[in-house]
């Protein structure tokens, strides 16, 4: 069987990246993201560069970070097809479905590859230390790299469910990964963790005709709280729902809404407040922003262009569940859904939350209009 | 700029064929799913087919009404979405949009929603 | 199938009134999505999953409900909201719409 992924990420636009570490040659690598249900990545400009990057970043593989590491990814130059020399790929293509976009925006390369027409070339993408991307580099493809990378799309994912008063979280995901957190898991994800007193609880992501949430998950909080308040989705008390500005960070816990004041919460339809804090609350009607905000908070609306071109299955079977793929975050101090939000998004998130829409226009506007813009 | 454009509408007999297409652009055509919507001169909305992305194998859904004489499809290094109209009938007059298929997270769920509308391509079948 | 009754058929409206339309399905559904139109252009998503409003929609809209009864909600007519609205569910093939309900600036 082959090794877990190491890490793995996903936007939301549903292209989800895993890194292995590996020894193989490069059959082998597409053999493994095959089986996984996905392919050997592309590693194209923008957001999806980008997301490979972070994977990259989150940490060195097994050697603790002292070598250069090489990655295939679905990059070569095909047998008929020369080195072109002034070319930001040398000549070389990605390997998929997709119509070209740009490749201006791509690595350098780390050695120039050998000029031919003749033989198929592959490449990989060199990692200084294992974690800084050097750059692309021609290898043969019946030599061993050191890992691969793989890509999944789905059409939908399960956004993470706030913990409350969960602990000890475990993300399992369809593909071989277990993390301790997820930002967007695909269908067949399952989280497990203890609520208070040790009780253990289970969800399970599943998609459906009318998208994708988890089961037997009631008010998106694995634990309900024991008192009022939520910050960044766990429980919090009064006093820690200030920011450092003063303003009210906290949202109200499932029976309670925001008192007439503002500043605190009160059980539902009750009147005034006699405790507070400033600002607004996290929970708002939804709502499009133009600037992302690292923390994730919901709902969100995010341009799609985090995902770029996807290569994958969606595998779904009707109306029943369909076995997808996850949307992981490293376990660094940000996730890399939220670096692709800060380095992309032209919408985002609000303190409260947006909205996130699978959403690739290239516009600047995150406006849906009639599809044919004109008659919007 | 997102858009679909779709053509191969026109005037056509009783029991005859039309192929409509749209041309989709600004968006990751190969990773959403598509449908085709009709609308009867001065009537509702009537949703026809759905097709999957490839990540759902290309999976079709149709209206019981145009099964077995309507076949919805895609060719994703194009970013074209079809309907091929068979057996056409008189009912079958309306505007056809091609319609994309978008994903809307809030809370812990996901939610498909028909969130862009080609301008529609009008068919006629009339003898 | 699952049908969705829209109602009022028609309906005016003059600035500043509250306007309710509702939708009834025939059997039970999870959510339900509402589309607005205006004469000779294509329909627009305008809430998504029974409440939550689309990108630029005015925030005097609302929607609420489950089960087999929904609702969209103007809490104040403006010109602009004069069109015609659809709902629409998909909990279960065929994806159906509702009749149409147009909405007229008295």
């Known amino acids: 069987e082959h090794p877990t992924a190491d890490r793995a990420g996903c936007s939301a636009s549903g292209a989800c990246y895993s890194l292995h570490h590996a020894t193989m040659k490069r059959q082998a690598a597409e053999e493994a993201c095959i089986l996984r249900g996905g392919a050997l990545s592309t590693v194209r400009a923008g957001a999806e560069l980008r997301a490979v990057l972070a994977l990259l970043r989150a940490g060195p593989g097994p050697g603790g970070g002292s070598k250069d590491l090489l990655f295939w990814v679905a990059l070569e130059r095909r047998r008929s097809h020369c080195t072109l020399e002034n070319e930001p790929l040398r000549g070389f293509s990605w390997l998929s479905s997709d119509p070209g976009g740009l490749e201006s925006d791509t690595l350098q390369w780390v050695e120039e590859p050998q000029r031919s027409c003749t033989a198929r070339r592959c490449a990989v993408l060199q990692a200084t230390g294992g974690v800084e991307p050097a750059g692309w580099k021609e290898m043969r493809c019946h030599l061993r790299a050191n890992g691969y990378l793989c890509k999944y799309q789905f059409e939908v994912l399960c956004p993470a469910p706030r913990p409350g008063a969960a602990s000890n979280l475990s993300y399992r995901a369809p593909f071989q990964l277990h993390s301790a957190a997820l930002d967007f898991s695909p269908p067949g994800t399952e989280v497990s963790a203890l609520c208070r007193g040790q009780l253990p609880i289970s969800v399970t992501c599943i998609a459906d005709e009318i998208g994708a949430r988890w089961d037997k998950l009631s008010g998106d909080v694995l634990c309900p709280c024991p008192g009022r308040y939520l910050r960044a989705g766990k429980c919090a008390e009064l006093p820690n729902c200030l920011d450092d500005l003063g303003g009210f960070a906290c949202e109200c816990a499932t029976g309670f809404e925001l008192g007439k004041d503002g500043r605190s919460c009160v059980t539902s339809g009750e009147g005034q407040p006699t405790l507070g804090g400033t600002g607004v609350p996290t929970r708002r009607p939804p709502a499009t922003a133009t600037s992302p905000v690292p923390q994730r908070t919901w709902p969100i609306r995010v341009d799609e262009k985090l995902g770029e071109t996807p290569l994958v299955p969606e595998q779904d079977n009707s109306v029943t569940s369909i076995p997808e793929i996850p949307r992981w975050g490293s376990q660094s101090t940000m996730s890399t859904l939220q670096m692709s939000l800060q380095a992309e998004s032209k919408a985002t998130i609000t303190p409260s939350g947006s909205v996130i829409s699978k959403f690739n226009s290239t516009t600047s506007s995150a406006t849906p209009q009639a599809f044919d813009s004109s008659s919007a | 700029e997102v858009q679909g454009v779709e053509s191969g509408g026109g005037l056509v007999q009783p029991k005859g064929s039309l192929k409509l297409s749209c041309a989709a652009s600004?968006?990751?055509?190969?990773?959403?799913?598509m449908h085709w919507v009709c609308q009867a001169p001065g009537k509702g909305l009537e949703w026809v087919a759905r097709?999957?992305?490839?990540?759902?194998?290309?999976?079709?859904y149709y209206a019981d009404s145009v099964k077995d004489r309507f076949t919805i499809s895609r060719d994703d290094s194009q970013s074209m979405l079809y309907l091929q109209m068979n057996n056409l009938k008189t009912e079958d007059t309306a505007m056809y949009y091609c319609?994309?298929?978008?994903?809307?997270?809030?809370?812990?769920?996901?939610?498909?929603?028909?969130?862009?509308w080609g301008q529609g391509t009008s068919v006629t079948v009339s003898s | 199938e699952i049908v969705l009754t829209q109602s009022p058929a028609i309906m005016s409206a003059s600035p500043g009134e509250k306007v309710t339309i509702t939708c009834s399905a025939s059997?039970?559904?999870?959510?339900m999505h509402w589309f607005q139109q205006k004469p000779g252009t294509s329909p627009k998503l305008w809430i998504y999953?029974?409440?939550n409003l689309a990108s630029g929609v005015p925030a005097r809209f609302s929607g609420s409900g489950s089960g087999t009864s929904y609702s969209l909600t103007i809490s104040r007519m403006e010109a602009e909201d004069a069109a015609t609205y659809y709902c629409?569910?998909?909990?279960?093939?065929?994806?159906t719409f509702g009749a149409p309900g147009k909405l007229e600036l008295k």
């Open positions: 319609v994309r298929e978008g994903v809307y997270y809030y809370g812990s769920s996901g939610y498909y929603a028909m969130d862009y």
């Open positions: 600004g968006f990751t055509f190969n990773t959403y799913a």
């Open positions: 097709i999957r992305s490839k990540s759902n194998n290309y999976a079709t």
């Open positions: 059997s039970s559904v999870s959510y």
């Open positions: 999953s029974t409440s």
């Open positions: 629409q569910q998909r909990s279960s093939y065929p994806l």
